[in-house]
Interface confidence: medium
């Protein structure tokens, strides 16, 4: 995933080394909260494999991505904006190894915001890159309704009110 001027781009399997791997994302969040369609292969083209990824200071590197764990607490939307302003996005969990890495680095047992919320437009849980959650993998405990956002705790995902304040994880 890449972020450019507040727009999230999804690149298949985290690699954009050739055009055939590019995947149109359709619905994408923009800084002002509106959505628009975008197809921008150029922004994806520069991203290559794990070995070229350099993480900024205070960011942890894992499997070609960079992660930042907050110490303060914010609402989901404030956390979302915080990550965007730092050219990243709230955490999207791709696989079990990534889940294990996240758990290893969460030193407390409290809830932590991730990049997943319930969109009333689609009436489904959606990652911040616009992709739907695979409900067979991630069972979200709690209500699926408007103003529900997802927080992780002990490798499980919980539905919480978006205005609640928790720590959060940014990723790029």
């Amino acid at each position: 995933l890449l972020v450019s001027q507040g727009v999230l781009l999804k690149c298949q399997k985290g690699s954009c080394s050739n055009a055939t791997q590019y995947e149109d994302t359709g619905d994408l969040k923009v800084n002002n909260g509106t959505r628009r369609n975008i197809s921008n292969k150029d922004l994806c083209a520069s991203r290559s494999a794990d070995q070229t990824v350099l993480c900024q200071s205070e960011w942890l590197k894992y499997q070609g991505k960079c992660y930042w764990f907050s110490n303060e607490m914010k609402s989901w939307s404030d956390s979302y904006v915080y990550c965007l302003e730092r050219k990243s996005h709230l955490l999207i969990i791709h696989d079990q190894l990534e889940m294990a890495f996240i758990q290893k680095n969460l030193r407390q047992l409290n809830y932590v915001w991730i990049g997943l919320n319930f969109t009333s437009l689609k009436m489904t849980w959606t990652w911040v890159d616009g992709s739907p959650i695979d409900s067979k993998i991630f069972f979200i405990k709690g209500p699926a309704k408007e103003n529900s956002c997802a927080a992780i705790k002990e490798s499980k995902i919980f539905s919480e009110t978006c205005s609640s304040v928790f720590k959060w994880i940014c990723q790029y």
Partner: antibody, heavy 113, light 110 residues
Framework: SLEESGGRLVTPGTPLTLTCTAS????????MSWVRQAPGKGLEWIGV?????SIWYANWAKGRFTISKTSTTVDLKITSPTTEDTATYFC?????????????WGQGTLVTV | ASDMTQIPASVSAVVGGTVTIDCQAS??????LAWYQQKPGQPPKLLIY???DLASGVPSRFSGSGSGTQFTLTITGVECADAAVYYC????????????FGGGTKVVVK
């Protein structure tokens, strides 16, 4: 239908790969699991490979097994078998619209360590 | 991960009678539970999913109930063909699984 193959007698520590061959269904768009059953014992879910290609293992199975797939097959590699891995290994499809349930099973292949 | 406990481990039934098998989850799994029947030398067969929905081709003498942490499989009007081992299985998210299956209940029909 699903058919497992590759089960045999192996010595401890020798990696073994089992293959599940599907006919009449598309592996790439299915949730394909491996489940095992030791002689006279119950069923143990090992892991699943999902349409996106991501793989999720049971907590106890992490590091002991590797699941992969092609367009028509799903493989299970037992990385370093021990006597505790002696079992019949089944592949199963999760065809449920919600939740995960196994509606199609192979006949199983026996691994003896 | 939710652990599944089945009670009893074995049960005897008479033809025409009723059998109930209980399954307990260690945490709330809502209605994401299935029941399977397994006969010797065969793979398991899906009987019930989502706690109470009958799988295709399964006789109506099989029924399931429960939600949350407590579930029951009932066989009403037991037949000789129902002699088998029955397993419950939680189905509420691959990311959280230790073992999805209960330990099994052997049904002996007399």
């Amino acid at each position: 239908s699903l058919e497992e193959s590759g089960g045999r007698l192996v010595t401890p520590g020798t990696p073994l790969t089992l293959t599940c061959t599907a006919s009449g269904l598309t592996v790439g768009s299915s949730y394909m699991s491996w489940v095992r059953q030791a002689p006279g014992k119950g069923l143990e879910w090992i892991g699943v490979i999902v349409p996106s290609g991501s793989i999720w293992y049971a907590n106890w199975a992490k590091g002991r097994f590797t699941i992969s797939k092609t367009s028509t097959t799903v493989d299970l590699k037992i990385t370093s078998p021990t006597t505790e891995d002696t079992a019949t290994y089944f592949c199963a499809r999760d065809g449920a619209s919600s939740g995960f349930y196994f509606d199609l099973w192979g006949q199983g292949t026996l691994v003896t360590v | 991960a939710s652990d599944m406990t089945q009670i009893p481990a074995s049960v005897s039934a008479v033809v025409g009678g009723t059998v109930t098998i209980d399954c307990q989850a260690s945490e709330d799994i809502e209605s994401y539970l299935a029941w399977y029947q397994q006969k010797p030398g065969q793979p398991p067969k899906l009987l019930i999913y989502d706690a109470s929905d009958l799988a295709s081709g399964v006789p109506s003498r099989f029924s399931g109930s429960g939600s949350g942490t407590q579930f029951t499989l009932t066989i009403t009007g037991v037949e000789c063909a129902d002699a088998a081992v029955y397993y419950c299985q939680q189905g509420h998210g691959y990311a959280h699984v230790d073992n999805a299956f209960g330990g099994g209940t052997k049904v002996v029909v007399k």
